[in-house]
């Protein structure tokens, strides 16, 4: 890509003390608090034996990681070329593409009646792999459009924090489920109330903090890219897992995991990798991506629920028969949020 006149609009000015205001601190604290309860609640839907099964027979996990670190960086790179983006725009998108899976995918997997054990194992493994894969992928894909050392800007501390924020509450949830199952219902119910309240607070604080700044990242090309990227991730994640004969639940899980990126890590890299006068409003690209991955994820969930609700009795009979023969009961979710038949091998819809 040749040198370009940088894309930032001429009326964009970063709010002074941006990122260091009391509202920014409040948002950070609430996000961590919210993530803890999300992971605690999700941990209550998991079982050690089934996590072990995914690790001993890692077909689903391997496909998921290939999707995460194969599809997403390549998608980001190709979109940059297809839309002939300016170097700095292509780099911002590439950083998002090379990020590991985000925690939103776990919530989406639950809503899509996916395999929660695979979902959490995949998020954990993709975050752990990010320690090596992010610098490698950024080095490979940024050659030709960036002469600095992008691989040196990988926030290892942030990756480790992400791991801790997933593993600790999930482990507490799993232990609680196996040792004190009677409290599980209250934990999940209480967790959901806290998550709901936190979601409202996060939405309000994000609107206050970012304000009109996000509008400056909303150029037609960036909107196209940030809407296409999660969609392509969801679609190709599903296609790849279908090609490798994973069952329906695992396909949906891999799909959600592939399309959802850890936008916080993406923001961290953009924050330190480029001078503010260069990155400008592109700093808000991860937030734009987050909005689209959230919107598209919710749309897919709505479509899935409608499909589940309006399936013809003939389909339902076929479904029950398939589930009986493959130990996959999609409609029959257990009360605690787990499903029978955790193996990701059977090639069923």
């Amino acid at each position: 890509m040749e040198a370009h006149n940088a894309s930032a609009p001429f009326n964009f000015t970063l709010p002074p003390n941006f990122g260091k205001r009391p509202t920014d601190l409040a948002l950070s604290v609430i996000l961590v608090f919210m993530l803890f309860f999300i992971m605690l609640s999700l941990g209550c839907t998991m079982e050690f034996s089934k996590i072990k099964a995914h690790l001993w027979k890692p077909k689903g996990l391997a496909i998921a990681l290939v999707a995460q670190y194969g599809i997403m960086p390549l998608t980001a790179f190709v979109l940059g070329k297809v839309f002939r983006l300016k170097n700095i725009e292509a780099l911002a998108i590439l950083v998002c593409g090379c990020s590991p899976g985000g925690n939103l995918s776990n919530v989406f997997s639950l809503a899509m009646k996916g395999d929660m054990n695979l979902s959490i194992v995949m998020t954990t493994c993709s975050t752990f792999c990010a320690l090596g894969m992010m610098p490698l992928l950024l080095y490979i894909y940024s050659r030709g459009i960036y002469d600095g050392d992008l691989k040196d800007k990988v926030p290892y501390k942030g990756i480790v924090i992400s791991l801790v924020l997933v593993l600790i509450p999930c482990t507490i949830g799993i232990v609680l489920k196996s040792k004190r199952p009677q409290y599980m219902r209250y934990v999940i119910k209480g967790g959901m109330i806290i998550i709901l309240l936190c979601s409202v607070a996060v939405t309000v604080l994000s609107a206050i903090n970012v304000g009109k700044s996000i509008m400056f990242a909303m150029t037609p090309l960036l909107i196209a890219t940030s809407s296409l990227m999660p969609f392509i991730g969801f679609l190709l994640g599903y296609v790849l897992s279908a090609l490798f004969c994973l069952n329906g639940r695992c396909r949906r899980t891999v799909s959600m995991e592939t399309g959802c990126q850890n936008v916080q890590l993406c923001s961290t890299i953009l924050n330190v990798a480029f001078p503010p006068e260069v990155i400008g409003p592109l700093f808000f690209f991860p937030l734009l991506y987050m909005i689209f991955q959230l919107g598209e994820g919710l749309l897919l969930i709505a479509i899935f629920w409608c499909y589940e609700k309006f399936k013809t009795p003939k389909d339902k009979t076929k479904m029950i028969y398939t589930a009986a023969t493959t130990e996959e009961t999609i409609p029959g979710a257990l009360g605690n949020g787990t499903y029978k038949g955790e193996d990701c091998s059977p090639c069923t819809a």
């Epitope: 040749e2 970063l14 960036y146 002469d147 924050n271 990155i279 400008g280």
Partner: antibody
Framework: QVQLQQSGAELVKPGASVKLSCKAS????????IHWIKQMSGQGLEWIGW????????KYSEKFKDKATLTADKSSSTVYMELNRLTSEDSAVYFC???????????????????WGQGTTLTVSS | EIVLTQSPAIMSASPGEKVTITCRAS???????LHWYQQKSGVSPKLWIY???NLASGVPARFSGSGSGTSYSLTINSVEAEDAATYYC?????????FGGGTTLEIK
């Protein structure tokens, strides 16, 4: 010691073009933006634009976008500014300056110039 | 585009005097993005004060800066002969870096 070494004075004819250079030393060239600033005799300072060697991205002031072209040679850590279709109005001292950068990140951007070149005097005269 | 107007354009002061140079903006500027430079005859400008009130390294303590919104000032508590120079204010807003017209300080 951070240094920006600019090329020597130039005397050129109206209508011609000229290429001024600014060689950076003792800092990581690809990590900073290099800006160009114009100062006409006895007058104030005028921002022209910046070049970011890291990605090759460029930004011009509206006033200079058809007048100046910024390029760089990364191997020699040099930024160039070519001025075309010269008139007497382009006679001035041209400075290159390094833009301040706080590596704690985006939030700490303060948008000033911490190091300046010694300036190149351009005289446009027939 | 934000226009910065400095006053006075030229001023003279005796050593030991207190001097104040003002810089007015056509619209509000963030104090974090308002800076001052000193330029002596025939040389390039030097960063003098950044973010309204922070002295750049090597700047004597007799210099200070203040202001907010559209009005900013640079003050020299007890002017010295070496302070003879032109002082420029600079702001950043909306991807534009603009400078004031400059104030030339002469020492009697």
């Amino acid at each position: 010691q951070v240094q920006l070494q600019q090329s020597g004075a130039e005397l050129v004819k109206p209508g011609a073009s000229v290429k001024l250079s600014c060689k950076a030393s003792d800092f990581t060239f690809t990590e900073y933006t290099i800006h160009w600033i114009k100062q006409m005799s006895g007058q104030g300072l005028e921002w022209i634009g910046w070049f970011y060697p890291g990605s090759g991205d460029i930004k011009y002031s509206e006033k200079f976008k058809d007048k100046a072209t910024l390029t760089a040679d990364k191997s020699s850590s040099t930024v160039y500014m070519e001025l075309n279709r010269l008139t007497s109005e382009d006679s001035a001292v041209y400075f290159c300056a390094r833009h301040m950068r706080d590596f704690r990140g985006f939030y700490y951007g303060r948008f000033y110039f911490d190091y300046w070149g010694q300036g190149t005097t351009l005289t446009v005269s027939s | 585009e934000i226009v910065l107007t400095q006053s006075p354009a030229i001023m003279s002061a005796s050593p030991g005097e207190k001097v104040t140079i003002t810089c007015r903006a056509s619209s509000s500027v963030s104090s974090s993005y308002l800076h001052w430079y000193q330029q002596k005859s025939g040389v390039s400008p030097k960063l003098w004060i950044y973010s309204t009130s922070n002295l750049a390294s090597g700047v004597p303590a007799r210099f200070s800066g203040s202001g907010s919104g559209t009005s900013y000032s640079l003050t020299i508590n007890s002017v010295e002969a070496e302070d003879a120079a032109t002082y420029y204010c600079q702001q950043y807003s909306g991807y534009r870096w603009t400078f004031g017209g400059g104030t030339t300080l002469e020492i009697k």
